[in-house]
């Protein structure tokens, strides 16, 4: 069966029907490049005016305008708000009332696209494997990133969150139109990774999405993540304004000027040098969501009532912090280089500025307890990674899970830890799952490109697709079309249940209280320490006059860019992390 031309609110669209075997039978209808909104520079997205005739939706559209890897140029375009749809089809009748999974990509709110990184036309976020294996509709889309998506003056002149509003427009478009493609508009699951996972979290918290989202999955990221909310947007807006020659004293004039500035100049005005900085890399993520009093009306911690009826899976990778650790403490990955106590203390103090010396010392002490017994470089390096993983991913995710559970009415809550080790040959032998390592398995790459993977990788991928799509179908990862290797029990506040995802998932993979000692430390011991820097949100970060252009991560999904270089400024860095 195949859909042919589909009538949407914008007009007719026609994709391609791809047979899954030479013998016929099952197939997948693929639509690429359907417009869901339009947007002017630094303005909220608007409804798309539509078209006449039949739109041939056969090619991915260009990504939203962003800096290239070398950061001396841009790629993508401003006209970028398009989505892609994969609809699995059986032999006879066209699909009807299928669950819908809407993907939000990561990339530090700075880079990325709905199709993801590609190698020889093999796109990372190709929805075919999820759609056909799980019998769900998969939707991916582009949203604005970087300054064009998140620049904000912190007031009504440039409220920011344009990229979040793009995401909302895509979700709302799916709600209104997906029935025509055979989807169930009342069963939409949004899922994402890293900045996309934080976006998923923010979308569930926003009052704008009331009634649109049934379920959500956040992979390595939350609205509560320290890198997910910009508390000092005006500083960064002024930084960009200065670089492009706009006035900075009056936000109205600054906004008006920025809106008529060449979007490529705006994009390139924010550069990410690779050199290690005085502060951890996440402090330099400038263009990210803000609390605008509207789309995000309050601090995310106060918005969990909005998720009371949204089923949620949230989890992290067991070494999510590794990618960040390699930037903040480069010796972590280098066998011939050593990590010193001083290196680690500097990292700790950079993440605990708000609590001053006491905060840094208490944190350093608890994380280095094992060093007396095992002072090996391997143990010290693993500690650095564990610390970054905890601060940036685990603790925010655990707090979010507890908040979700505490506010739940009909909603169910599930937690996981992805522990299938990275396949990167250059990594140390002790390496676990790095940031973004989960993506290839969720998107079924071990099946799509089998020669690059082992049977154990296919086992991981099969299990993840089964759990994810069952959850999308029923709100329970165990119940649906796909058999699962073991029962995944819901998260409870008492036990902190989580599923440990490895190559062999058994009943023993259901575990409890992940890193309980450290969670208690951050939630209790650290939390009660006095804040020493006053209101850390009002402090300004070091100014950046550098023009050095580094190589950011080449994979769209990788969250962390490298911060701006500035050796001349010794100013106090504000804590963007507040536990």
């Amino acid at each position: 069966a195949k859909l042919g031309a589909v009538y949407t609110e914008g007009g007719f669209v026609e994709g391609v029907n791809k047979k899954l075997s030479l013998l016929g039978g099952d197939s997948v209808d693929i639509f690429k490049g359907i417009p869901f909104a339009t947007a002017k520079t630094l303005e909220n997205p608007q409804r798309h005016p539509g078209w006449q005739g039949t739109l041939k939706a056969t090619n991915f559209k260009k990504r939203c305008l962003q800096a290239t890897i070398t950061q001396d140029n841009t790629y993508g375009q401003e006209d970028c708000l398009y989505l892609n749809i994969w609809v699995p089809q059986g032999r006879k009748q066209v699909s009807h009332n299928l669950p819908v999974m809407v993907w939000i990509y990561g990339g530090a709110f700075l880079m990325g696209s709905g199709q993801g990184a590609n190698f020889l036309k093999n796109y990372l976020y190709d929805g075919e494997e999820i759609a056909t294996r799980g019998n769900v509709i998969v939707v991916t889309f582009n949203y604005r990133v970087g300054p064009l998506g998140f620049l904000s003056t912190g007031d009504a002149n440039l409220p920011g969150n344009f990229g979040l509003r793009d995401q909302h427009m895509a979700i709302a478009w799916v709600k209104r139109n997906i029935a025509a493609f055979g989807g169930d508009p009342d069963n939409i699951t949004i899922f994402g990774e890293s900045a996309g996972a934080a976006s998923v979290s923010l979308q569930t918290l926003s009052p704008y999405n009331k009634g649109l989202i049934r379920r959500a999955i956040s992979q390595s990221g939350m609205a509560l993540s320290p890198w997910a909310i910009q508390k000092n947007p005006l500083f960064w807006a002024k930084t960009i304004a200065k670089k492009v020659g706009c006035p900075t004293e009056d936000t109205g004039k600054m906004a008006a000027c920025l809106k008529i500035t060449d979007p490529r100049a705006l994009t390139l005005a924010y550069k990410l040098p690779v050199k290690k900085q005085e502060y951890p890399v996440v402090h330099y993520l400038a263009f990210i969501p803000v609390i605008d009093g509207d789309f995000i009306p309050d601090d995310p911690i106060n918005l969990y009532n909005n998720t009371a009826d949204i089923d949620y899976i949230a989890g992290i990778n067991n070494m999510d912090g590794h990618l960040f650790a390699t930037i903040d403490v480069p010796a972590v990955d280098k066998t011939k280089q050593t990590v010193t106590e001083e290196d680690f203390y500097r990292l700790v103090s950079g993440h605990t500025v708000a609590k001053g010396l006491k905060g840094a010392q208490a944190t350093f002490d608890i994380y280095t307890e094992s060093w007396a017994q095992d002072p090996s470089q391997e143990n010290m390096k693993k500690t650095v990674v564990a610390f970054e993983t905890d601060v940036l991913f685990l603790i925010p995710t655990e707090i979010a899970l507890a908040q979700h559970k505490a506010h739940a009415k009909s909603a169910k809550t599930y937690s996981y830890l992805f522990s299938h080790p990275s396949r990167m040959p250059i990594y140390p032998k002790w390496m676990g799952a790095d940031h973004a390592d989960d993506l290839q398995y969720v998107f079924g790459k071990p099946f799509a490109t089998p020669l690059g993977y082992r049977p154990q990788d296919r086992a991981v991928s099969k299990a993840m697709i089964a759990y994810w799509t069952n959850f999308a179908r029923s709100g329970d990862p165990n119940m649906g079309n796909s058999p699962v290797p073991t029962h995944w029990y819901p998260y409870t506040l008492e036990n902190g249940n989580y599923l440990d995802i490895t190559k062999t998932i058994t009943s023993a993979s259901m575990k409890e209280h992940l890193r309980e000692k450290f969670l208690k430390f951050w939630a209790v011991t650290f939390e009660v320490l006095p804040t020493v820097t006053g209101d850390q949100d009002t402090l300004t970060p070091p100014e950046d006059d550098s023009e050095v252009a580094p190589d950011p991560p080449s994979d769209d999904s990788q969250v962390v860019p490298v911060p701006p270089t500035d050796d001349s400024v010794e100013a106090q860095m504000p804590a963007t992390i507040g536990f």
Epitope: T8, F12, R176
Partner: antibody, heavy 119, light 105 residues
Framework: QVQLVQSGAEVKKPGASVKVSCKAS????????MHWVRQAPGQGLEWMGV????????SYNQKFQGRVTMTRDTSTSTVYMELSSLRSEDTAVYYC????????????WGQGTLVTVSS | DIQMTQSPSSLSASVGDRVTITCRAS?????LNWYQQKPGKAPKLLIY???SLASGVPSRFSGSGSGTDFTLTISSLQPEDFATYYC????????FGQGTKLEIK
């Protein structure tokens, strides 16, 4: 100027079929979608479906699926709406209506064709 | 399908009056239009995209709203305005409101 001229009134028996035509002029026929909307006596408007005259693509209201067929003849700039298995509740005025622009409202309407279904 | 509910279903007013008709969608919509229909005639487009005036329509007609709540306002009723008004949502399955009959008081 844009004109949509529909065929004349029809009286049909239950179970029969009716085919209503709508001849377009004053614009490029293949460039705009054509919709069919009906209105039962004293009732409101009900969307039946749409056809793209360019390639013949159609989409029908679920309610009429299997009973309605929309076709077009580009040589005469005419669209047709055929409704089968007629019942008394299909008695209505049937309108063709052209899109205004883009994914826009129904900007131009035919004069309507009364179809009466009676035994 | 999205249900469109108009209120009131009928309304009596006098020439010169200001009249407001509301239309509520059962879920958020992107495209809303207003039509006027006189007895024995085809509907005529008045307002499209919630607030844009169709060509040739007098400026006394205006539309507003977004999401689920929309209004059609006639600032000063003229004798030729007495008719039935319909709202219409344009989606993959378009639907109309049940109509509001505007009569002379």
């Amino acid at each position: 100027q844009v004109q949509l001229v529909q065929s004349g009134a029809e009286v049909k028996k239950p179970g029969a079929s009716v085919k209503v035509s709508c001849k377009a002029s004053g614009y490029t026929f293949t460039s705009y979608n054509m919709h069919w909307v009906r209105q039962a006596p004293g009732q409101g408007l009900e969307w039946m479906g749409v056809i793209n005259p360019g390639d013949g693509a159609t989409s029908y209201n679920q309610k009429f699926q299997g009973r309605v067929t929309m076709t077009r003849d580009t040589s005469t700039s005419t669209v047709y709406m055929e409704l089968s298995s007629l019942r008394s509740e299909d008695t209505a005025v049937y309108y063709c209506a052209r899109d205004y622009y883009g994914s826009s409202p129904l900007g131009y309407w035919g004069q309507g064709t009364l179809v009466t279904v009676s035994s | 399908d999205i249900q469109m509910t108009q209120s009131p279903s009928s309304l009596s007013a006098s020439v010169g009056d200001r009249v407001t008709i509301t239309c509520r969608a059962s879920s958020s919509i992107s495209y809303l239009n207003w039509y006027q229909q006189k007895p024995g005639k085809a509907p005529k487009l008045l307002i499209y995209a919630a607030s844009s005036l169709a060509s040739g329509v007098p400026s006394r007609f205006s539309g507003s709203g977004s999401g689920t709540d929309f209004t059609l306002t006639i600032s000063s009723l003229q004798p030729e305005d007495f008719a039935t008004y319909y709202c219409h949502q344009r989606s993959s399955s378009p639907t109309f409101g049940q109509g509001t009959k505007l009569e002379i008081k």
